[in-house]
C-alpha cells in the first residue's frame, strides 16, 4: 500500500502513525497549496486540528480580513490557522469543534459542538454550530444561530456599532454577543470588568478575560 | 481601571425610600450606559432600570414602573436609583454595571446582560418591617 504524504487535517495525520502533538503541514482540499498547523495527538483520542490559539498575549489578533483568511502567528504559540483553509476543510465532512478554555484561578472548561462549519467567503464565513456539550457553559457563548466572521476592515455584525473595532480581535460577533476569543489580552489581576477583552460569557461570565484558549477541530467520525 | 461603586443600601421599612448611588471611575458616562440589577436569594440576576445618552434614554422593568426612578451627574460621574414605594418583594442585593452605549442591536433600544461587562460589588436592600 502506497503511504500517504499528503494530509487534510491532523486526523489522518494520527491515523497516518504520527501520533506525537507539534507542528504538521496540511493540504488544502482539492489543491497542491499547503499550510502549517499545531495538531494535538494527546487530546481526548488525539488527532485535533488546532485553529485558534492564545496563551500568553505575544501576538496582536486585531488584525484585517485578509490575515484572518489566511492565518496569522505561529503553530508553536498564539495562532489564528485561517478561514479559508478551515471552510474549505469543514465544508468537505463532518467536524466537531472543542474550545477548551482556562481561567486565571487555575480552572479549566470546554464547550464541544457535535457538527461546526464555515461557510465561504461569499457569505463572510458564517459559523454553524450545533450540539453543545461540555463543562464551560449549558448555553452557547457563541450566539445561535451563527453569525458572520466580522474585523477591523469589514464589519458584518448586527450591532449599530462596528464591534471588531469596539471589543478589538476578529470574530463572529452578534451585537455584539457572548464571547470573542480574539480580543485584547490582559494579565492576571487586570482581567476583569473589561469591555474587550477574551471572553466567554456562559462560563466565566461579564468583562472576564481569559488566560488561554485553544479552538481545535477533528472529523466527526474519528 | 474600570471602576463601579454602589452604596446607600440599607433596611427600610415597607412604603419607605432609598436612593442608591453607583460611582463610576476609568471611564465617562457620556459614552456608556449605566443599568442597574438586583439579585435576591435563590433567584436569577434581572434588570431593573439602565440609562444612556445623559439620560436621554432611560428604561424600567414592570415591576418598578412609577416607583423607582434613574437618573445621572456626569459631572460627578455618578447614576442614582431613587426608590420608593418599596415592598418586601424589593429585597435584593443591587448591583450597577455598565455597557459601552453603541453597543446596540440594529432595531432594539437595550443590551442583553452579556453585553454588560463592568460590574460594582452590590449594595444590599432590605426591605422588612
Known amino acids: 500500500k502506497e503511504e500517504q504524504t499528503t494530509f487534510r487535517d491532523c486526523a489522518e495525520i494520527f491515523k497516518s502513525g504520527l501520533t506525537t502533538s507539534g507542528i504538521y503541514t496540511l493540504t488544502f482540499p482539492n489543491s497542491t497549496e499547503e499550510i502549517k498547523a499545531y495538531c494535538d495527538m494527546d487530546v481526548g483520542g488525539g488527532g485535533w486540528t488546532v485553529i485558534q490559539h492564545r496563551e500568553d498575549g505575544s501576538v496582536d489578533f486585531q488584525r484585517t480580513w485578509k490575515e484572518y483568511k489566511e492565518g496569522f502567528g505561529s503553530p508553536l504559540g498564539e495562532y489564528w490557522l485561517g478561514n479559508e483553509f478551515v471552510s474549505q476543510l469543514t465544508g468537505q465532512h463532518r467536524y466537531v469543534l472543542k474550545i477548551q478554555l482556562k481561567d486565571w484561578e487555575g480552572n479549566e472548561a470546554h464547550s464541544l459542538y457535535d457538527h461546526f462549519y464555515l461557510a465561504g467567503e461569499e457569505s463572510n464565513y458564517r459559523i454553524h454550530l450545533t450540539g453543545l456539550t461540555g463543562t464551560a457553559g449549558k448555553i452557547s457563548s457563541i450566539s445561535q444561530p451563527g453569525s458572520d466572521f466580522s474585523t477591523k476592515d469589514s464589519d458584518n455584525d448586527k450591532c449599530i456599532c462596528k464591534c471588531s473595532q469596539m471589543l478589538s480581535g476578529g470574530w463572529w460577533f452578534d451585537a455584539c454577543g457572548p464571547s470573542n476569543l480574539n480580543g485584547q489580552y490582559y494579565p492576571q489581576k487586570q482581567n476583569t470588568n473589561k469591555f474587550n477583552g477574551i471572553k466567554w460569557y456562559y462560563w466565566k461570565g461579564s468583562g472576564y478575560s481569559l488566560k488561554a484558549t485553544t479552538m481545535m477541530i477533528r472529523p466527526a467520525d474519528f | 481601571e474600570v471602576q463601579l461603586v454602589e452604596s446607600g443600601g440599607g433596611l427600610v421599612q415597607p412604603g419607605g425610600s432609598l436612593r442608591l448611588s453607583c460611582a463610576a471611575s476609568?471611564?465617562?458616562?457620556?459614552?456608556?450606559?449605566i443599568g442597574w440589577f438586583r439579585q435576591a436569594p435563590g433567584k436569577e440576576r434581572e434588570g431593573v432600570s439602565a440609562?444612556?445618552?445623559?439620560?436621554?434614554?432611560?428604561y424600567y422593568a414592570d415591576s418598578v414602573k412609577g416607583r423607582f426612578t434613574i437618573s445621572s451627574d456626569n459631572s460627578k460621574n455618578t447614576v442614582y436609583l431613587q426608590m420608593n414605594s418599596l415592598r418586601p418583594e424589593d429585597t435584593a442585593v443591587y448591583y450597577c454595571?455598565?455597557?459601552?452605549?453603541?453597543?446596540?442591536?440594529?432595531?432594539?433600544?437595550?443590551?442583553?446582560?452579556?453585553?454588560?461587562?463592568?460590574w460594582g460589588q452590590g449594595t444590599l436592600v432590605t426591605v422588612s418591617s
Open positions: 440609562i444612556r445618552d445623559n439620560g436621554g434614554s432611560t
Open positions: 454595571a455598565a455597557v459601552p452605549a453603541g453597543r446596540l442591536r440594529f432595531g432594539e433600544q437595550w443590551y442583553p446582560l452579556y453585553e454588560y461587562d463592568a
Open positions: 476609568g471611564f465617562t458616562l457620556d459614552d456608556y450606559a
